[in-house]
């Protein structure tokens, strides 16, 4: 049996953060958007991903992992420069491929120690190990040509499910819902919201039947559809309210009135 190196217990140092706000807890705020952000975790002394709701929250929130590290990890930039000459690969680059316990289908990349290259693999969507990257570029940076040893995260960072060959492009019926082909369809340039709100409903790749809502840019409304539990796209919300909040704001009804609230 293939046993993975343990990556669950780590020694905690007594490092002081650079700014007081780095010690704040991650705060997703009261709104319901799902924006991938990063925060500094005082307990693990690492920058970690969290989902930001889109409003309020606190200062311990960064758009990129790099920005979070630069702001909150003492000496991060210095060690990055110092290590650039001859950096070692993090231990997790040598872990064997682990698709994880679940069976969603996500396109990921891992470092193959045999070929000394980053390669694509299919990740199941939960657990697994840290030799698991969202992009080829990220894998190469960290494991093929490490510029600096990154602060390892506790678990795999999740990203959107792979939908290769499974994205619905143009159909008038989605999961038995007839999508009205209205003559008043807003043109794409009239929509200033999140791009995924323009995607068609996609029921995904698995076998469950979960009630979800998608935004129909033709009607300006959120409609119900059946989600199979994995795969699909970001036009997928657990409630109609959350769907409307996330997508309705981007529809420009009238140039003088501005954005619909």
């Amino acid at each position: 049996l293939s046993e993975e190196a343990d990556d669950t217990d780590s020694e905690l140092g007594s490092m002081k953060p650079l700014h007081t706000f780095c010690a704040m807890k991650a705060d997703d705020g009261p709104c319901k958007a799902m924006i991938r952000s990063y925060f500094f975790n005082m307990y693990t002394h690492q920058c970690e991903e969290f989902i930001y709701g889109g409003c309020e929250g606190n200062e311990n929130r960064f758009d990129t992992l790099e920005e979070c590290k630069k702001t909150c990890i003492p000496g991060y930039e210095k060690t990055a420069v110092k290590a650039a000459s001859g950096a070692e690969r993090p231990d997790f680059c040598f872990l064997e491929e682990d698709p994880g316990l679940c069976r969603g289908y996500m396109k990921r990349y891992l470092y193959n120690n045999q070929t000394k290259q980053c390669e694509r693999f299919v990740y199941g969507g939960c657990l697994g190990n840290r030799n698991n990257f969202e992009t080829l570029d990220e894998c190469k940076k960290i494991c093929e040509n490490p510029v600096h040893s990154p602060s390892p995260v506790n678990e795999v960072q999740m990203s959107d499910y792979v939908t290769d060959g499974n994205t619905v492009t143009d159909r008038s019926t989605v999961n038995n819902i007839v999508v009205p082909q209205s003559p008043k369809v807003p043109r794409r340039r009239d929509y200033r919201g999140r791009p995924w709100c323009l995607q068609p409903a996609d029921s995904g790749l698995c076998k469950a039947s979960e009630r979800r809502f998608y935004y129909n840019s033709a009607t300006g409304k959120c409609h119900r559809f059946n989600y199979t539990g994995c795969g699909g796209n970001n036009n997928n919300f657990t409630t109609r309210r959350r769907c409307l909040r996330s997508c309705k704001t981007g529809l420009i009804k009238n140039k003088s009135k501005g954005v619909v609230k």
């Epitope: 049996l1 293939s2 046993e3 993975e4 990556d7 669950t8 991650a26 997703d28 799902m34 969290f50 989902i51 491929e97 682990d98 698709p99 316990l101 679940c102 069976r103 199941g124 969507g125 939960c126 657990l127 506790n154 678990e155 999740m158 990203s159 959107d160 499910y161 698995c206 076998k207 469950a208 979960e210 979800r212 989600y227 539990g229 699909g232 970001n234 997928n236 919300f237 657990t238 959350r242």
Partner: antibody, heavy 123, light 112 residues
Framework: QVQLQQSGPGLVKPSQTLSLTCAIS??????????WSWIRQSPGRGLEWLGI?????????RYAVSVKSRITINPDTSKNQFSLQLNSVTPEDTAVYYC?????????????WGQGTLVTVSS | DIVMTQSPLSLPVTPGEPASISCRSS???????????LNWYLQKPGQSPQLLIY???NRASGVPDRFSGSGSGTDFTLKISRVEAEDVGVYYC?????????FGQGTKVEIK
């Protein structure tokens, strides 16, 4: 309908090895849409996950750090079962032991459980 | 390890009345599209646990619709709209965001 049938001794002496088996019917231990786990329950510690095995392109396992140095979970494909071995037991290992199936396709959860085996560690 | 904390630990209920159990995790369990890596189980007296709710809010096969799961991130709730006598037992939440898989300490639901 998946059924998990546990077997093994209810009494084990301290320092010896606890061995339990879980026979599967209605599914295969080699299924790529399942994973197979051992979980124990004691009054002091509640439900405690011990480890899991699963077959994808090959076999994988993961163990809880608390028992990692003492535990082995193995599949037996010929008998369609899997086993738990816990070495060097102490009275602290006294608990009800459950085998369980993790549904990897639909539920993403432990959707079938064995009947439980009370194991007492005592001399 | 992700610590799962349930409250209350004991919940006396009246048949026909609603009941609510809270589960809080020490780290966010949210994934994409509002999926939360959290399950709920019920262990009836003298039985093995059974899966009630998966991915935070989806009822497992054969689970009555009086059971519902909600919440996101670190705060989750299991609600029983109208408690029936057969609902007594210990309810557990469980996370699968990271190893080790961890359970809450349980909430014992009993009839008043």
């Amino acid at each position: 309908q998946v059924q998990l049938q546990q077997s093994g001794p209810g009494l084990v002496k301290p320092s010896q090895t606890l061995s339990l088996t879980c026979a599967i019917s209605g599914d295969s231990v080699s299924s790529d849409s399942a994973a197979w786990s051992w979980i124990r329950q004691s009054p002091g510690r509640g439900l405690e996950w011990l480890g899991i095995i699963y077959k994808r392109s090959k076999w994988y396992n993961r163990y809880a750090v608390s028992v990692k140095s003492r535990i082995t979970i193995n599949p037996d494909t010929s008998k369609n079962q899997f086993s738990l071995q816990l070495n060097s037991v102490t009275p602290e290992d006294t608990a009800v032991y459950y085998c369980a199936r993790w549904h990897s396709d639909k539920h993403w959860g432990f959707d079938d459980w064995g009947q439980g085996t009370l194991v007492t560690v005592s001399s | 390890d992700i610590v799962m904390t349930q409250s209350p630990l004991s919940l006396p209920v009246t048949p026909g009345e609603p009941a609510s159990i809270s589960c809080r995790s020490s780290q966010s369990l949210v994934f994409r599209f509002g999926i939360n890596y959290l399950n709920w189980y019920l262990q009836k007296p003298g039985q093995s646990p059974q899966l009630l709710i998966y991915k935070g809010s989806n009822r497992a096969s054969g689970v009555p619709d009086r059971f519902s799961g909600s919440g996101s991130g670190t705060d989750f709730t299991l609600k029983i709209s109208r408690v029936e006598a057969e609902d007594v037992g210990v309810y557990y939440c469980q996370q699968y965001t990271s190893y080790p898989l961890t359970f809450g300490q349980g909430t014992k639901v009993e009839i008043k």
